[in-house]
């Protein structure tokens, strides 16, 4: 009975060639989603002008396939039980998913002058960048197509800096014909507890980011984890989007198309300010910003985008502290749609459901220099997007799994 | 105290080419700005280019339609300025100055000044 | 390119008394103004930096005021050792601009 399962189980869920686990892990069978709300600021000029809070109204969803790519350069590593992998990034926009078309128009922060005023805080190198930004007539606040914003574009200011910059700009620019990776992780042969656990990230076992234990590459990639997943466990994964690992811990049961599953959700803990939870101390990597390490909900992450002011957060501030939000009108933040979750079938520990929630904010702060900038008396963390990718197991697959799996338990 | 020592000035005539040096004393040199400011004749007081702390951004105004080239040796603690296509209006005492705006003194532009070199383009 | 119209051209004026020197901008240079400070055979001294901050060591009898447009640079008691040229300095935006200088002798 059990014993059996448990062997089999053991077998399949390995990540070798042959087994259900591989096929499904090389490319995966679930169509995923990535949802795009994009932050439209209703009042640039009053902002620019008068420092007045920004009042954003959310537009979308613009819907994306995205995932649908097989894996890349799988090697399997049989000295150290490991197979390594590039997943490539794709992204095909889905008309009939969204509430318009790439060609939309969205009134955002310049990410180009806002990034450049943080990344180049020197009085005269602000003055040179002011001269460059006014003769190319950009302001605080751009008008972008979607595709524009989400997939990059030349900037007229960058165009004009006669040294070597990037002059192409978007949110996740670059992203198709890009790959993330390369990922070793374990292929379970050896030890099944340690299936889909990475061994390492482009070549590390640390991202080089943060301090102490927060810099470490923890657990799978979430889209499974090793099997006979108890609910008292706290699943550790890590996100490339984030920049960090996180952790996920169960909150209720749930019936998914006939499967029993355990929800997941990352808990408001995990947001906290290291005065909430001192766990989070080396998450907090300057002291400016984050009044001292008390905000808490917002997760800068420049030193891992080139020092660009990007902070990560989730959907409408949610489990935001009242100083982040407190410069932005027009946010609701509201638990059921703005959480992440993740539904695990426990026996296999495969990730059947999920919904992977996150929102893309830019820092622009006063600069004496830099004209545009000038007039602002504070610090804002703008809201530019924030995304839903969610995946669900198909009606087949589900049937399948019904079958093979939670049929032969019960 | 803040030393600057400028040098290379001299007469030459209209179309020739000229390279003044600036030498400090200070071991910072390498994490502060730059600048050249020259006094005409007329007593006006101008600035000729400048440069950051590493060298990568610099600027001229347009005046000075892109004859002159400033540059930096951090290692030798030493600011240069290449002449070149000089005029009788480039007439001037060339100073190298220093921005102090370090340690949160914002805007602190030409804190400190070398005692100057002179140029004199005639025929 | 933003000017500067510094005046007047030279002033007399008598130990003890109260100067002042006047920079309009063509342009609008919130307060981005700096006062310099020559005196024959030496190089330019830097008195007072943008937001109207004096410098260490600058004696509080030299101050300024402004905003926008219109700035004052003011010596409370003249001394002697004030004698020199003084030139105004629009740091706002490239190219930097400087007054045409205001000569400062003694009646």
């Known amino acids: 009975g059990d014993m059996l399962i448990q062997k089999t189980i053991k077998k399949e869920v390995v990540l070798e060639e042959g087994t259900i686990a591989f096929k499904n892990w090389v490319k995966t069978g679930t169509e995923i989603y990535r949802q795009f709300w994009i932050f439209d600021v209703q009042n640039p000029q009053e902002v620019m002008m008068n420092s007045s809070n920004i009042q954003v109204k959310q537009r979308g969803p613009y819907t994306y396939r995205v995932r649908f790519l097989a894996k890349e350069n799988i090697t399997q590593d049989p000295k150290d039980n490991t197979v390594s992998f590039l997943q490539p990034n794709g992204a095909i926009f889905e008309p009939s998913l969204s509430v318009g078309t790439e060609a939309d128009n969205f009134t955002v922060l310049n990410l180009a002058v806002a990034a450049a005023s943080h990344i180049y805080p020197n009085p005269f190198v602000q003055v040179v960048l002011n001269s460059l930004i006014n003769k190319s007539k950009s302001s605080m606040f751009q008008v972008r197509t979607l595709r524009e914003l989400l997939w990059g574009y030349t900037d007229p200011f960058l165009s004009l800096v006669p040294y070597p910059v990037s002059t192409r700009v978007g949110m996740f620019y670059p992203y198709n014909n890009t790959a993330d990776g390369v990922y070793k992780v374990f292929n379970g042969k050896d030890s099944i507890s340690k299936v889909a656990i990475i061994d390492t990230y482009k070549g590390k076992r640390n991202l080089s980011y943060w301090e102490s234990y927060c810099d470490m590459i923890n657990g799978t990639d979430a889209a499974s984890f090793p099997p006979f997943v108890e609910k008292s466990q706290v699943l550790q994964f890590f996100s490339s989007d984030i920049c960090r690992s996180i952790y996920a811990v169960f909150e209720s049961d749930v019936n998914l198309k006939g499967i029993p599953v355990y929800r997941f959700v990352l808990p408001s803990k995990a947001f906290a300010s290291p005065v909430q939870n001192p766990d989070n101390h080396c998450f907090c990597t300057e002291k400016i910003i984050s009044k001292n390490c008390t905000s808490y909900g917002v997760l800068d992450i420049s030193k891992c985008k080139e020092g660009k002011p990007v902070y990560i957060s989730l959907p409408h501030f949610l489990y935001a502290s009242p100083d982040v939000s407190e410069t932005i009108d027009g946010l609701n933040p509201n638990e059921e749609e703005h959480r992440t979750y993740l539904d695990i079938e426990p026996i296999t520990g495969f990730t059947l459901q999920f919904a992977k929630r996150l929102q893309v904010n830019l820092l622009v702060k006063p600069s004496n220099k830099i004209q545009v900038l000038k007039r602002l008396k504070r610090n804002y963390i703008v809201p530019i997007l924030w995304l839903n990718e969610t995946g669900t197991i198909g009606d087949e697959k589900a049937k399948m799994f019904r079958s093979q799996v939670t049929g032969k338990i019960n | 105290e803040v030393q600057l020592v400028e040098s290379g000035g001299g007469l030459v005539q209209p179309g020739e080419s000229l390279k003044l040096s600036c030498e400090s004393n200070?071991?910072?040199?390498?994490?502060?700005?730059m600048s050249w400011v020259r006094k005409t004749p007329e007593k006006r007081l101008e600035l000729v280019a400048a440069?950051?702390?590493?060298?990568?951004?610099?600027y001229y105004p347009d005046t000075m339609e892109r004859r002159f080239i400033i540059s930096r040796d951090n290692t030798k603690k030493t600011l240069y300025l290449q002449m070149s296509s000089l005029r009788s209006e480039d007439t001037a005492l060339y100073y190298c100055?220093?921005?102090?705006?370090?340690?949160?003194?914002?805007?602190?532009?030409?804190?400190?000044w070398g005692q100057g070199t002179l140029v004199t383009v005639s025929a | 390119e933003t000017t500067v119209t510094q005046s007047p051209a030279s002033l007399s004026m008598a130990i003890g008394e109260k100067v002042t020197i006047r920079c309009i901008t063509s342009?609008?240079?919130?307060?981005?103004m700096n006062w310099y400070q020559q005196k024959p055979g030496e190089p330019p001294k830097l008195l007072i930096s943008?937001?109207?901050t004096l410098r260490p060591g600058v004696p509080s009898r030299f101050s300024s005021t402004g905003y926008g447009t219109d700035f004052v640079f003011s010596i409370e008691n003249m001394l002697s050792e004030d004698v020199a040229d003084y030139y105004c300095?629009?740091?706002?935006?490239?190219?930097?601009?400087f007054g045409s200088g205001t000569k400062l002798e003694i009646k």
């Open positions: 100055a220093r921005h102090g705006y370090d340690y949160d003194e914002e805007g602190a532009w030409f804190a400190y």
């Open positions: 200070e071991y910072e040199f390498p994490s502060h700005d």
């Open positions: 440069i950051n702390s590493d060298g990568g951004y610099t």
């Open positions: 300095l629009q740091s706002d935006n490239l190219p930097f601009t």
């Open positions: 342009t609008d240079i919130d307060d981005d």
């Open positions: 943008e937001g109207n």
